[in-house]
C-alpha cells in the first residue's frame, strides 16, 4: 500500500514554555527542562520517589482536541532507571508505568476531577522499557507507541501513572493515521482517516482522474488501520483521445497528429494514411480533402478515395443485345470493395450526348445493372437500329461520400436487326378433355420473315412447362388433362432469333365426360 500519513494532535517536543500538566500528588511528577538528542531544549516530566513505598503518582496532559479521529496513537519517549542500580531502596521499586486516557466533550478536568484512578480513566497499557539504565550510564531513551479507540467525544486527556519508578518522560506525541490521497487505476481517492480499530477497513470512494472514464464500478479503495491503502475495487481508464501518462496517474490528450479511438490503456497512435488531426485529444483523425471513410470503416482505418474510371470498355453487339466488358480502374482509391454500375442512354437523331436520354425500364441487364462485381454485363431488349451510349461507372464504399458523380468510361454502339416483337393475343378455338386448339395473330413488328412459333404451356396445378413449335399461327395442344387450367405463351422466331413471349394466357380443358364443344374465345393477356 501507499505510505501512511501521520497527523499530530499534540507533541511536547515543540513546546518550549511550561507544559503545566496536572500532577497528583504534587510531590509526584515534576516538570523539568532538558535537552533532546539533538540538544534542542525540551520540557520533560520526571518522577523518582523510589525510596518510599506505595507510590501512586498521576500526571495528566492538557485537553487534546480529537478532530473527528476515531483512533489515537501515542508515542512515548522515556528513560527508566534500573532498580538494581539504586542502593537502599525497598522492594516496591518499579521499572514500568501505566498509560491512561479520559474522554471529555470539553476541557473539564481539574486537580481533583476526574478521580485519579482507573475508571474513570481508561487504561491503555503498562509501559515497560526495552532498556533501563544505571547511574553510571547515560540515560537510554525508550520509544513506545500505543493506540486506543474508538473515540467519540470532542477530545481527551492522557494520563500517566507511576507506582514507584525512577523515570523521565522525555516526550509525548499524540497523533492519528490516515491514508494519503492517491491515484490508482486512473482513479483519485481522497485522504481518508483510519477506522476505530487496527483491523478496520474504511471505504474511500474514488473519482476518475480528468479525461478518464469508469470501466467498472463502484470505485473504492480501503484504508486500513495502519493508514495504508488496500483492496482496490473498480477502475477507470483513459477516455478516447487520451493516453496513460505518469505511471497511470494521468490521462494525457493525444498530441496533434495522433488519435485514440477507443477508451483504454493503449497509447495514442499516429493518424492513419490520408488523415490528420488539427487539435489535441482526437478520438478520430479527419480525412484529407477528397478522401473519405465509409460508414462501415473503423476509426483506425485509412481514409480512401473513389476509384478512377474503368479501362478498356469493349462492346460486342448482337442484334438488339450486347455484351460489355472492361478492365479494372488504374486506381482503386485504396479500397477493395469495388463495384460497377452500367448506365444506359438511348440517343436520338444525329446529335451528341445532349440528344441522349435514359433507357426504358424494359432494358434487361444480366447479372444486374448496378453493383456489379464482375467486369461483364449482358444487355438485352434494346431497340433495333438505335444508337446507345453506355457509361460504365466504377464505385466503391466511399463513392456515396464524394460530392462528385462516379468516374466512368463510355462506349457508343448501334444495334442492328431485332427479333420479332411480342405476339399480341391468343384465341381458343376449341377445347376437349385432353386438348386445346389455339391460334394467334402475328407480331406487330415481325422484323423479318417469321420462321416458326414456339409455344410454352404448363398446367397451373402442376407447374411443369412443355414446349411445342408450329410453322403456322395455330396449334393443337394434346396430351392434356381434363378439368385442368393451363397457362400458355407464344413467341415468334426469325433469323434474328426468338422474340419475347406473349403475355401469359389461361385456358381450361373440359371434363372427360363433357363434349369437345367449339368454344371460340379470344383470350387477351391476363
Amino acid at each position: 500500500g501507499c505510505r501512511a500519513l501521520e497527523e499530530t494532535l499534540m507533541d511536547t517536543k515543540w513546546v518550549t514554555s511550561e507544559l503545566a500538566w496536572t500532577s497528583h500528588p504534587e510531590s509526584g511528577w515534576e516538570e523539568v527542562s532538558g535537552y533532546d538528542e539533538a540538544m534542542n531544549p525540551i520540557r520533560t516530566y520526571q518522577v523518582c520517589n523510589v525510596r518510599e513505598s506505595s507510590q501512586n503518582n498521576w500526571l495528566r496532559t492538557g485537553f487534546i482536541w480529537r478532530r473527528d479521529v476515531q483512533r489515537v496513537y501515542v508515542e512515548l519517549k522515556f528513560t527508566v532507571r534500573d532498580c538494581n542500580s539504586i542502593p537502599n531502596i525497598p522492594g516496591s521499586c518499579k521499572e514500568t508505568f501505566n498509560l491512561f486516557y479520559y474522554e471529555a466533550d470539553s476541557d473539564v478536568a481539574s486537580a481533583s476531577s476526574p478521580f485519579w484512578m482507573e475508571n474513570p480513566y481508561v487504561k491503555v497499557d503498562t509501559i515497560a522499557p526495552d532498556e533501563s539504565f544505571s547511574r553510571l550510564d547515560a540515560g537510554r531513551v525508550n520509544t513506545k507507541v500505543r493506540s486506543f479507540g474508538p473515540l467519540s467525544k470532542a477530545g481527551f486527556y492522557l494520563a500517566f501513572q507511576d507506582q514507584g519508578a525512577c523515570m523521565s518522560l522525555i516526550s509525548v506525541r499524540a497523533f492519528y493515521k490516515k491514508c494519503a490521497s492517491t491515484t490508482a487505476g486512473f482513479a483519485l481517492f481522497p485522504e481518508t482517516l483510519t477506522g476505530a480499530e487496527p483491523t478496520s477497513l474504511v471505504i474511500a470512494p474514488g473519482t476518475c482522474i480528468p479525461n478518464a472514464v469508469e470501466v467498472s464500478v463502484p470505485l473504492k479503495l480501503y484504508c486500513n488501520g495502519d493508514g495504508e491503502w488496500m483492496v482496490p475495487v473498480g477502475a477507470c481508464t483513459c477516455a478516447t483521445g487520451h493516453e496513460p501518462a505518469a505511471k497511470e496517474s494521468q490521462c494525457r490528450p493525444c498530441p496533434p497528429g495522433s488519435y485514440k479511438a477507443k477508451q483504454g490503456e493503449g497509447p495514442c497512435l499516429p493518424c492513419p494514411p490520408n488523415s490528420r488531426t488539427t487539435s489535441p485529444a482526437a478520438s478520430i483523425c479527419t480525412c484529407h480533402n477528397n478522401f473519405y471513410r465509409a460508414d462501415s470503416d473503423s476509426a483506425d482505418s485509412a481514409c480512401t478515395t473513389v476509384p478512377s474510371p474503368p479501362r478498356g470498355v469493349i462492346s460486342n453487339v448482337n442484334e438488339t443485345s450486347l455484351i460489355l466488358e472492361w478492365s479494372e480502374p488504374r486506381d482503386l482509391g485504396g479500397r477493395d470493395d469495388l463495384l460497377y454500375n452500367v448506365i444506359c442512354k438511348k440517343c436520338h437523331g444525329a446529335g451528341g450526348a445532349s440528344a441522349c436520354s435514359r433507357c426504358d425500364d424494359n432494358v434487361e441487364f444480366v447479372p444486374r445493372q448496378l453493383g456489379l462485381t464482375e467486369r461483364r454485363v449482358h444487355i438485352s431488349h434494346l431497340l433495333a437500329h438505335t444508337r446507345y451510349t453506355f457509361e460504365v461507372q466504377a464505385v466503391n464504399g466511399v463513392s456515396g461520400k464524394s460530392p462528385l458523380p462516379p468516374r466512368y468510361a463510355a462506349v457508343n454502339i448501334t444495334t442492328n436487326q431485332a427479333a420479332p416483337s411480342e405476339v399480341p393475343t391468343l384465341r381458343l378455338h376449341s377445347s376437349s378433355g385432353s386438348s386445346l386448339t389455339l391460334s394467334w395473330a402475328p407480331p406487330e413488328r415481325p422484323n423479318g420473315v417469321i420462321l416458326d412459333y414456339e409455344m410454352k404451356y404448363f398446367e397451373k396445378s402442376e407447374g411443369i412447362a412443355s414446349t411445342v413449335t408450329s410453322q403456322m399461327n395455330s396449334v393443337q395442344l394434346d396430351g392434356l388433362r381434363p378439368d385442368a387450367r393451363y397457362v400458355v405463351q407464344v413467341r415468334a422466331r426469325t433469323v434474328a432469333g426468338y422474340g419475347q413471349y406473349s403475355r401469359p394466357a389461361e385456358f381450361e380443358t373440359t371434363s372427360e365426360r363433357g363434349s369437345g364443344a367449339q368454344q371460340l374465345q379470344e383470350q387477351l393477356p391476363l
Epitope: S461, R485, V487, E506
Partner: antibody
Amino acid sequence: QVQLQQPGPDLVMPGASVKLSCKASGYTFTNYYIHWVKQRPGQGLEWIGQIDPSDSSTDYNQKFKGKATLTVDKSSSTAFMQLSSLTSEDSAVYFCARSSTGPWGQGTTLTVSS
Amino acid sequence: DIVMTQAAPSVPVTPGESVSISCRSSKSLLHSNGNTYLYWFLQRPGQSPQLLIYRMSNLASGVPDRFSGSGSGTAFTLRISRVEAEDVGVYYCMQHLEYPLTFGAGTKLELK
C-alpha cells in the same frame, strides 16, 4: 428467383383460429396454383388443398374441409390459409408451394398449446 | 384416395455406391395422355421438400444426373448412383393423377 416466404413459428391456444401467410415473389402470382401441405413432427406429408390466385377457386382434401380455408390477396401476391377450432393435432409445419412441384416455402411451425 | 406406399422407412448406403428407393401406388398413375403422374421429392434435414423427378422419369431443373426415375403404372423406383453426403434426407414419392394429392410415408437415406 422464385421465392415463397412464410413467417416464423406461431403459438396458438386450443380452440382458437390462426391465419398463415405465404408471400410469393419472382414470378407472375396468378399463373400458378398455390398448394398447402401439412407435416407433423417426424411424420410424412399431407396435402391440404390448392387455390388458383387468378379467381380464388379452390380444391380441398376432404379431410381438411371445415378445418382449412384458402384465400389469396392478388395485390400483395400473398396466399393465406386459415385453420379453425385448433387442437393439438393441428400442431405441425405447414408448407405452401408454387404448384405441386414447387418450389416450396420454408414452412411455418404452428404449435397449439395452452 | 390413392395410397402411396414406401415399404422401406430407411436405407443405409456407403458414399460412392448406388441405391434404389421404391414406391408403390394403389392405382395406376399412367394417364390416358401417356404421362405417369408420379413425382419424387427430397427433404433435407431442416429444409422444405425439393423436386427431383417429375412424371416418373424426368429430371427436374438443377438436379444432378446421378438421380433417375423409372417404373410402371404402380411400381416406381428412384435410383441414385454415386451417393454423396448432400443426398442425405427423406425421399417422398407423390401422385398427382387425381385429388387429393397423396404422398408416400418417406424413406430416409442414411450414410453408413
